[in-house]
């Protein structure tokens, strides 16, 4: 992040930006920036694979939930959206697109129906769903 | 906003930031930044007046809805939260804290009970509620 104060002195702006204020990002244009992560909610319903491809085409991935503190904005998300969590039938675990395992106590996993993909819903709930079912989705980009 | 590309060349960073990426803000620390507006959701339930005071103490105001396009992140907000919309009994209009009148077709106004304050709920709905009822609230800061 570029401290707003640093930028302010650097460019000798007239507007004084309080020390507590800062810039967030960088993020793709018109994405949500929160605690230096970038999020975008996509209205168009796609299956999990298409959703993943859409995020990848924007240099992002499907939502990864890694911290209730850093991602507390997710508490208030309405509806159900594909996230990057998939079931590995060989060992029965749930893992993210990057291969990391779902940390315990991060998500409450609820079985909607038999499936290997998961939808994110408010208050850190993950709903197991058939990967081929079209749903809206959340892309995420972690800043450098 | 500081274009990420501009910052990148200025500081001669090694990481290449795509032209389509940009910084958002400035915002108070740990607030949500979206389309250069800053938002924060407060969990603690307060009446409308206390909510307003809380936002003001953070150099912000209660949520003002002014554009469905610029504020489309509000579509997916779960639950009910105080916003800066109040009823003016003398002329029967609804206006924001800054004195501006609620634009037509921005919010669907629904009466919960008799009241002069309004709660924001998903999909651009405003619920009329008694100002003394404690609720969570949304603060907003528009960037310079």
């Amino acid at each position: 992040i570029w401290s707003a104060v640093f930028l302010n002195s650097l460019f000798n702006q007239e507007v004084q930006i309080p020390l507590t204020e800062s810039y967030c990002g960088p993020c793709p244009k018109n994405w949500i920036c929160y605690k230096n992560n970038c999020y975008q909610f996509f209205n168009e319903s796609k299956n999990w694979y298409e959703s993943q491809a859409s995020c990848m085409s924007q240099n992002a991935s499907l939502l990864k939930v890694y911290s209730k503190e850093d991602q507390d904005l997710l508490k208030l998300v309405k509806s159900y959206h594909w996230m990057g969590l998939v079931h590995i039938p060989t060992n029965g675990s749930w893992q993210w697109e990057d291969g990391s395992i779902l940390s315990p106590n991060l998500l409450t996993i609820i079985e909607m129906q038999k499936g290997d993909c998961a939808l994110y819903a408010s208050s850190f709930k993950g709903y197991i769903e058939n990967c081929s079912i079209p749903n809206t989705y959340i892309c995420m980009q972690r800043t450098v | 906003i500081w274009s990420a590309v501009f910052l990148n060349s200025l500081f001669n960073q090694e990481v290449q930031i795509p032209l389509t990426e940009s910084y958002c803000g400035p915002c108070p620390k740990n607030w949500i930044c979206y389309k250069n507006n800053c938002y924060q959701f407060f969990n603690e339930s307060k009446n409308w007046y206390e909510s307003q005071a809380s936002c003001m103490s953070q150099n912000a105001s209660l949520l003002k809805v002014y554009s469905k396009e610029d504020q489309d992140l509000l579509k997916l907000v779960k639950s009910y939260h105080w916003m800066g919309l109040v009823h003016i009994p003398t002329n029967g209009s609804w206006q924001w804290e800054d004195g501006s009148i609620l634009s037509p077709n921005l919010l669907t106004i629904i009466e919960m009970q008799k009241g002069d304050c309004a709660l924001y709920a998903s999909s651009f709905k405003g619920y009329i509620e008694n100002c003394s009822i404690p609720n969570t609230y949304i603060c907003m800061q528009r960037t310079v």
Partner: antibody
Amino acid sequence: EVQLLESGGGLVQPGGSLRLSCTASGFTFSSYAMSWVRQAPGKGLEWVSLISESGSSTYYADSVKGRFTNSRDDSRNTLYLQMNSLRAEDTAVYYCAKDRWFEGYHSYYGMDVWGQGTTVTVSS
Amino acid sequence: DIQLTQSPSFLSAFVGDRVTITCRASQGISNNLAWYQQKPGKAPKLLVYATSTLQSGVPSRFSGSGSGTEFTLTVSSLQPEDFATYYCQQLKSYPSFTFGPGTKVDIK
């Protein structure tokens, strides 16, 4: 004037079906949850079903679950109660009511507008 | 399931009397309690909601109070048009509504 008008009641044999309608006027129908409440002859009020403002959530009393279906058509400002597998104990006056229940909200503000009721008699 | 009981089930009173009806819940509930008035052959009418808030247009002689498991509806000075049956109603945590058995208020 805010009004609810029920119709569709009548005499039906046990095991039969009936569809009640409730037409709303004078308020924004699509913005409110709607309930059905019934009252058996000489008895008290019994809540039957609620449908949320969006129509996405429906709730039923245990006594009617699996037999009754509550639905709404916002374009017609109309609420419906489809009643199947009717029993003698379903005999009652059925009221529809505008319900100030808001999904996920901490307070409940009651059923503030009621229809005049329609009588359903289940008898052979 | 939370049960509601009302007492008395029948009440005989004079015009001008102060009348109190009690509604008890089988376990503690929030303030999501409402009171309705019903006259013979008519639909119920909402009087009080959220335990103590008077519905618009309802005379101020009606009032509601209570918390936890015990709630009351009071009519400070009974009028001829107040003779009716009164029901309390409670909303459980998910939308399932329970009505009390009713209290019939009659002219003495």
